[in-house]
Interface confidence: low
């Protein structure tokens, strides 16, 4: 029998799969590649023409507890003279990630996967100008 | 969600740490948000540091499709529409969590995996190294 996966590709289920109650899935939260490090260019959030700041959000009932969000510093972009040019726009770049949410119901606890939208930085774009008739 | 009974003294025995293995509901909260960056915005084309998007597909992972950005130029696009090599287009990278099927091919057994993705590009002033 073929078992559908999240996302409609079909797999032949191996015999070695662990038994899982209906409507749920087994999740090992020991992270693969836990010690991987981001190797981004240095201080790009300050050197960008669309600079941004970082804020750390903390939630003990979320795994991982710490999620870092970026916020663009300006509406416009920084020009060669170091001044804000409002003819251009600083806009956020976003990426989805998964987190595990722990929910308490009385003396019981449940776990739910959740998609979270993270703002990772900003980029400078030419604005879309809408002409009104 | 799937509820797990807590021990009899549950009001006083709050566990601050997540267990190593959890049973989670198959329904993912916020699952239907738009995951295709080409459809969600055209920043990749309008940016002064434009990028192309590469579809990375892996059926052993959820989400199975992830979009990777690659900057189109070394420099940035100036007001005249030309590439200015006095500035640099650089990728903005982010660590995200995905689900990896473990054991492989199992429909309902996963492990969290951290992967590094390039989400887009931004235009930066280069770091100039002066050689003595």
């Amino acid at each position: 029998r073929k078992i559908p996966k999240v996302g409609h590709t079909f797999f032949q289920k191996p015999e070695s799969c662990p038994p899982v109650p209906g409507g749920s899935m087994k999740l090992d939260i020991g992270i693969i590649n836990e010690n991987q490090r981001v190797s981004m260019s240095r201080n790009i959030e300050s050197r960008s023409t669309s600079p941004w700041n970082y804020t750390v959000t903390w939630d003990p009932n979320r795994y991982p507890s710490e999620v870092v969000q970026a916020q663009c510093r300006n509406l416009g972009c920084i020009n060669a003279q170091g001044k804000e040019d409002i003819s251009m726009n600083s806009v956020p770049i976003q990426q989805e990630t998964l987190v595990v949410r722990r929910k308490h119901q009385g003396c019981s606890v449940s776990f739910q996967l959740e998609k979270v939208l993270v703002t990772v930085g900003c980029t400078c774009v030419t604005p879309v100008i809408h002409h009104v008739q | 969600g799937i509820t797990i009974p807590r021990n009899p003294g549950c009001p006083n025995s709050e566990d601050k740490n997540f267990p190593r293995t959890v049973m989670v509901n198959l329904n993912i909260h916020n699952r239907n948000t738009n995951t295709n960056p080409k459809r969600s915005s055209d920043y990749y084309n309008r940016s002064t540091s434009p990028w192309n998007l590469h579809r990375n597909e892996d059926p052993e992972r959820y989400p199975s499709v992830i979009w990777e950005a690659k900057c189109r130029h070394l420099g940035c696009i100036n007001a005249d529409g030309n590439v200015d090599y006095h500035m640099n287009s650089v990728p903005i990278q982010q660590e995200i969590l995905v689900l990896r099927r473990e054991p492989p091919h199992c429909p309902n057994s996963f492990r969290l995996e951290k992967i590094l993705v390039s989400v887009g590009c931004t235009c930066v002033t280069p770091i100039v190294h002066h050689v003595a």
Epitope: - | K38, N45, N52, L53, W67, E68, K70
Partner: nanobody, 122 residues
């Protein structure tokens, strides 16, 4: 399998113009592109257009001089080449690919035409 047939190549003087055509038949694709190979050099990306025709991509060396387009049926792709230079001399290939990502990577193109020679010389 997609069949591709290019036409429109020839000899032109520097500063002149040419229009290349590529007729496609067979299964659908995500993008069509023009790539070129000059004598003794590697094949390089010139321009690409998405299957919908909404997205176009150009190599920096041709931006502003070349324009890629498709007819309404989507079966024919064009490359309008203006302000031609001697360094544009090459065999121009039409190709298709899946995905719009890394369009400049010639290794990602799956189906290739036989090529049409463009010579820019006075």
């Amino acid at each position: 399998e997609v069949q591709l047939v290019e036409s429109g190549g020839g000899l032109v003087q520097p500063g002149g113009s040419l229009r290349l055509s590529c007729a496609a038949s067979g299964r659908t694709y995500d993008a069509m592109g023009w790539l070129r190979q000059a004598p003794g050099k590697e094949r390089e990306f010139v321009a690409a257009i998405s299957g919908s025709g909404d997205d176009t991509y150009y190599a920096d060396s041709v931006k502003g001089r070349f324009t890629i387009s498709k007819d309404n049926s989507g079966n024919t792709m064009y490359l309008q080449m203006n302000s031609l230079r001697p360094e544009d001399t090459a065999v121009y290939y039409c190709a298709t690919r899946r995905g719009l990502y890394y369009v400049w990577d010639s290794n990602d193109y799956e189906n290739w035409g036989q090529g049409t020679l463009v010579t820019v010389s006075s």
